[in-house]
């Protein structure tokens, strides 16, 4: 079957500091040396690109300096971390993988990870 399967967890709960991590794993039909990973956020039928990185197999993912994402790769597995999340960022985060080089190109899109973000309660003033 000429398609690439992408697997990611169904649900992840962000930490109290607004950090969420999940693994994006792809079954590569070919031996890619250059891979692009994009995280898309789907909420209310709107889709926005959260972050994207292109990496050479065996090397680290490099996101833009101002990106809210960081990540590491190991074989056909990418460990993604999204930072700075707030309750309003709750939504479906979809992992998109593209095998850029060498040919042929392959596209794979995961089913998405529902990330729940709960803003921490403000600490009450304490008199000591």
């Amino acid at each position: 079957c000429k398609a690439m399967h992408v697997a990611q967890p169904a649900v992840v709960l962000a930490s109290s500091r607004g950090i969420a991590s999940f693994v994006c794993e792809y079954a590569s039909p070919g031996k890619a040396t250059e891979v692009r990973v994009t995280v898309l956020r789907q909420a209310d039928s709107q889709v926005t690109e959260v972050c994207a990185a292109t990496y050479m197999m065996g090397n680290e993912l490099t996101f833009l300096d101002d990106s809210i994402c960081t990540g590491t790769s190991s074989g056909n597995q990418v460990n993604l971390t999204i930072q700075g999340l707030r309750a309003m960022d709750t939504g479906l985060y979809i992992c998109k993988v593209e095998l850029m080089y060498p040919p042929p190109y392959y596209l794979g899109i995961g089913n998405g990870t529902q990330i729940y973000v709960i803003d921490p309660e403000p600490c009450p003033d304490s008199d000591f």
Epitope: C1, K2, A3, M4, H5, P29, E34, R36, T38, L40, V47, E49, A52, T54, K96, E98, M100, Y101, P103, P104, Y105, Y106, L107, G108, I109
Partner: antibody
């Protein structure tokens, strides 16, 4: 809103060259792959070429490989198709099309005719 | 290369009728990466369906897609006058990107 506008088409003799342009607006150009698709008179759609993101990765249909070159200038939000050694069978309307977030071609230009 | 074969070549129907268009792939392709486009004379194609069954933005719900493996279907539940056009299927999961030869839906 997303807009793609092709230009540069015209009448050219076999063996000669032509350069098509596609001006993009309304979206972050460098975040998308852009394709060229052509349609011969009265015929179906034929994929021609694609260039991805920063312009390093390009793919071509076998029918144009070695004769056509796709390029992009992200600072100008413009896509190009340099067509050399043109043949009669290259006569077609040429469309540029954006590869959307999910992969399909979600926005198309109006096309430019090459004869 | 994945070859897509559409049938029928031409479909002659009346407004209000249901249209069913077929697209068959030469090898198994994931329906997650199959799209349908509509093209009217003198116009650029317009994306209707992607991922075999998801409607593109602004596409009315009378258009629906389904399928898996090598067979995909586009259905138009009740043909409106503006639906008479040529429809193309496309696979976009791997290079080279390929289109079917098209199905013309004409007024009977």
């Amino acid at each position: 809103q997303v807009q793609l506008v092709e230009s540069g088409g015209g009448v050219v003799q076999p063996g000669r060259s032509l350069r098509l342009s596609c001006a993009a607006s309304g979206f972050t150009f460098s975040s998308y792959g852009i394709h060229w698709v052509r349609q011969a008179p009265g015929k179906g759609l034929e994929w021609v070429a694609v260039i991805w993101y920063d312009g390093r990765n390009k793919y071509y249909a076998d029918s144009v490989k070695g004769r056509f070159t796709i390029s992009r200038d992200n600072s100008k939000n413009t896509l190009y198709l340099q067509m050399n050694s043109l043949r009669a069978e290259d006569t077609a309307v040429y469309y540029c099309a954006r590869a959307g977030n999910w992969g399909p071609f979600d926005s198309w230009g109006q096309g430019t005719l090459v004869t | 290369e994945i070859v897509l074969t559409q049938s029928p070549g031409t479909l002659s129907l009346s407004p209000g009728e249901r249209a069913t268009l077929s697209c068959r792939a030469s090898q198994s392709v994931s329906s997650s990466y199959l799209a349908w486009y509509q093209q009217k004379p003198g116009q650029a194609p317009r994306l209707l369906i992607y991922g075999a069954s998801s409607r593109a933005t602004g596409i009315p719900d009378r258009f629906s897609g389904s399928g898996s493996g090598t067979d995909c279907t586009l259905a138009i539940s009740r043909l409106e006058p503006e639906d008479f056009a040529v429809y193309y299927c496309q696979q976009y999961g791997s290079s080279p990107w390929t289109f079917g030869q098209g199905t013309k839906v004409e007024i009977k």
